[in-house]
Interface confidence: low
């Protein structure tokens, strides 16, 4: 029942142009090019997009025209390979152009950079932005797509179109407002934060597909969709999983036109079949396409059917367990996952996958035993510790968060993770620990029944950021091990890491702890990052420092910054008091 089986088209580019319309076609091609060639100037990309669009129009007019029968990868790859500065800007990525499809596209994908060396996006004054928006709205919005796409090479393209629509709406409304800044800035902050979260969530989906295979993604999707649509039949969930897997495989593979087209078809299918999927879809399905797809992706879990029987009957007590398992392992395990997940919206997806894996391992062992039924009879007892581990961890960490507040909770995590994996770069440790710390404000406010899915699935997203950043420049075997051994056990793997006893402490460098008056003009967030960077460096110098020692030094540091920022001659204060602080810190830590 796949939604996506279409008749073959003579011209794929014409087909997608007609399906998506010119505006979406151009936006998606721009995103695709910016995600591949992340360093190219905006104007170069616009030129390439216009050339591709003009070509697509000739194919719409005559599908038999020259080159119209070529695949999208061939057309787009050929276009990217015309960039004159490819070798000097991208180095070995230029070698991709010597390859044939599909190897050429694979090569481009492998060169996507999760941490490109690009300047931080600085937000201009509101009046400057509004003038630019009014002067040339189209260029202004294209620039937004380009800047986000090149910094987030795995951003979910159809969702970026939704963000761009909201970005446009914010400027349309706020540039006419009496107080433009009060109207616009909170909206831009919200889009920035949601955008970062959306990018990170999609990055995990792509990592799941690319590093662990389609099977891993499908397992994740079965669990998540079964929680979300517990009234849907297994066949319906399986069909949605198949279609969703195709959509994300396409987007993660750079096939953005196909991905956006198929996502629209999937949204259409879901809305046409609401009755057999979920009672929560009505509002979503009344929205325009981009909003509809976003709304469906975020829709709350439907209520569980009231009369669900015990799982034990089919999966433990039945004498046919091994027979059913042997006949179709994947389907049987899929059904187990579906049945367990629809009964447990209170569990994280990764926990559900751990349970399914434990069940599978037990069947592998027991179905080969003399008395299979006796062997697997107690399988559900094995689940108890797996369920209790994240429950206890979340309880402890939420208590700590409530006691410390977000900033100090982040600091506790910074110390914890720096001690676990001190080889990781300081900026990565700061970024990842700050994000890990946000789990407190995000999830601890929820009631017990919603805490685990919120917390552990969010932590999976954040730890994936650590994994993809570390993969670019691997420095720690422990990080590599936790990242590559098992997708669902990443968080328990990191949680289980103790202090790295093999780490040789970094040489003390006073320069690292030399601060200047410019810290006084930073925003609160940037000032926190500066202090947290210093904290990580302290731990790297003295990994055996106690919490009390580190707290004392950080308190001294906070007092030092506050004092010097109030001084008349700030720079002199930072120079003089800074020397004292470094000496005091060295004494306190025995450096």
């Amino acid at each position: 029942r796949g939604v996506f089986r279409r008749d073959a088209h003579k011209s794929e580019v014409a087909h997608r142009f007609k399906d998506l319309g010119e505006e979406n076609f151009k936006a998606l091609v721009l995103i695709a090019f910016a995600q591949y060639l992340q360093q190219c100037p905006f104007e170069d990309h616009v030129k390439l997009v216009n050339e591709v669009t003009e070509f697509a129009k000739t194919c719409v007019a005559d599908e038999s025209a020259e080159n119209c029968d070529k695949s999208l990868h061939t057309l787009f790859g050929d276009k990217l390979c015309t960039v004159a500065t490819l070798r000097e800007t991208y180095g070995e990525m230029a070698d991709c152009c010597a390859k044939q499809e599909p190897e050429r596209n694979e090569c481009f994908l492998q060169h996507k950079d999760d941490n490109p060396n690009l300047p931080r996006l600085v937000r201009p004054e509101v009046d400057v932005m509004c003038t630019a928006f009014h002067d040339n709205e189209e260029t202004f919005l294209k620039k937004y797509l380009y800047e986000i796409a090149r910094r987030h090479p795995y951003f979910y393209a159809p969702e970026l179109l939704f963000f761009a629509k909201r970005y446009k709406a914010a400027f349309t409304e706020c540039c006419q407002a009496a107080d433009k800044a009060a109207c616009l800035l909170p909206k831009l902050d919200e889009l920035r934060d949601e955008g970062k979260a959306s990018s990170a969530k999609q990055r995990l989906k792509c990592a799941s597909l690319q590093k662990f295979g389609e099977r891993a993604f499908k397992a994740w999707a079965v669990a998540r969709l079964s929680q979300r649509f517990p009234k849907a039949e297994f066949a319906e969930v399986s069909k949605l999983v198949t279609d969703l897997t195709k959509v994300h495989t396409e987007c993660c593979h750079g096939d953005l036109l196909e991905c956006a087209d198929d996502r629209a078809d999937l949204a259409k299918y879901i809305c046409e079949n609401q009755d057999s999927i979920s009672s929560k879809l009505k509002e979503c399905c009344e929205k325009p396409l981009l909003e509809k797809s976003h709304c469906i992706a975020e829709v709350e879990n439907d209520e569980m059917p009231a009369d669900l029987p015990s799982l034990a009957a089919d999966f433990v007590e039945s004498k046919d367990v091994c027979k059913n398992y042997a006949e179709a392992k994947d389907v049987f395990l899929g059904m187990f996952l579906y049945e367990y997940a629809r009964r447990h919206p209170d569990y994280s997806v990764v926990l559900l996958l751990r349970l399914a894996k434990t069940y599978e391992t037990t069947l592998e062992k027991c179905c080969a035993a003399a008395d299979p039924h006796e062997c697997y009879a107690k399988v559900f007892d094995e689940f108890k510790p797996l369920v209790e581990e994240p429950q206890n961890l979340i309880k402890q960490n939420c208590e700590l968060f409530e006691q410390l507040g977000e900033y100090k909770f982040q600091n506790a995590l910074l110390v914890r993770y720096t001690k676990k994996v001190p080889q990781v770069s300081t900026p990565t440790l700061v970024e990842v620990s700050r994000n890990l710390g946000k789990v407190g404000s995000k999830c601890c406010k929820h009631p017990e029944a919603k805490r685990m899915p919120c917390a552990e699935d969010y932590l999976s997203v954040v730890l994936n950021q650590l994994c993809v950043l570390h993969e670019k420049t691997p420095v720690s075997d422990r990080v590599t091990k936790c990242c590559t051994e098992s997708l669902v056990n990443r968080r328990p793997c990191f949680s289980a890491l103790e202090v790295d006893e093999t780490y040789v402490p970094k040489e003390f460098n006073a320069e690292t702890f030399t601060f200047h008056a410019d810290i006084c003009t930073l925003s609160e967030k940037e000032r926190q990052i500066k202090k947290q960077t210093a904290l990580v460096e302290l731990v790297k110098h003295k990994p055996k420092a106690t919490k009390e020692q580190l707290k004392a030094v950080m308190d001294d540091f906070a007092a030092f910054v506050e004092k010097c920022c109030k001084a008349d001659d700030k720079e002199t204060c930072f120079a003089e008091e800074g020397k004292k602080l470094v000496a005091a810190s060295q004494a306190a830590l025995g450096l």
Epitope: F212, G213, R215, K329, K357, K481
Partner: nanobody
Framework: EVQLVESGGGLVQPGGSLRLSCAAS????????MAWYRQAPGKGLEFVSR???????NYPDSVKGRFTISRDNSKNTLYLQMNSLRAEDTAVYYC?????????WGQGTLVTVSS
Amino acid sequence: EVQLVESGGGLVQPGGSLRLSCAASGSIESINRMAWYRQAPGKGLEFVSRISKGGSTNYPDSVKGRFTISRDNSKNTLYLQMNSLRAEDTAVYYCAAGPVWEQFWGQGTLVTVSS
């Protein structure tokens, strides 16, 4: 898809040794776990050993200390070194692999332990 081809089976005397190989091809980048299973005549499948991408291994008591699983990632090959073989080790040995669950299987290679 991943294709797996086992080799190295044959007839061996009790107490002897054999080394099985399993060559993997196809979408091997997604493979996280590789394992050996066996099926004795008229019996069910039995788990023999497993190795993860990171190199961690596990064995059932029946083969622990006698069998060693290893993996050469550069050659995309899985091995099973079988020492101190016994008559009850006679079986068809299957290589299996997968990202989360071992869904890809080879055709099997027959090992006969007999004097």
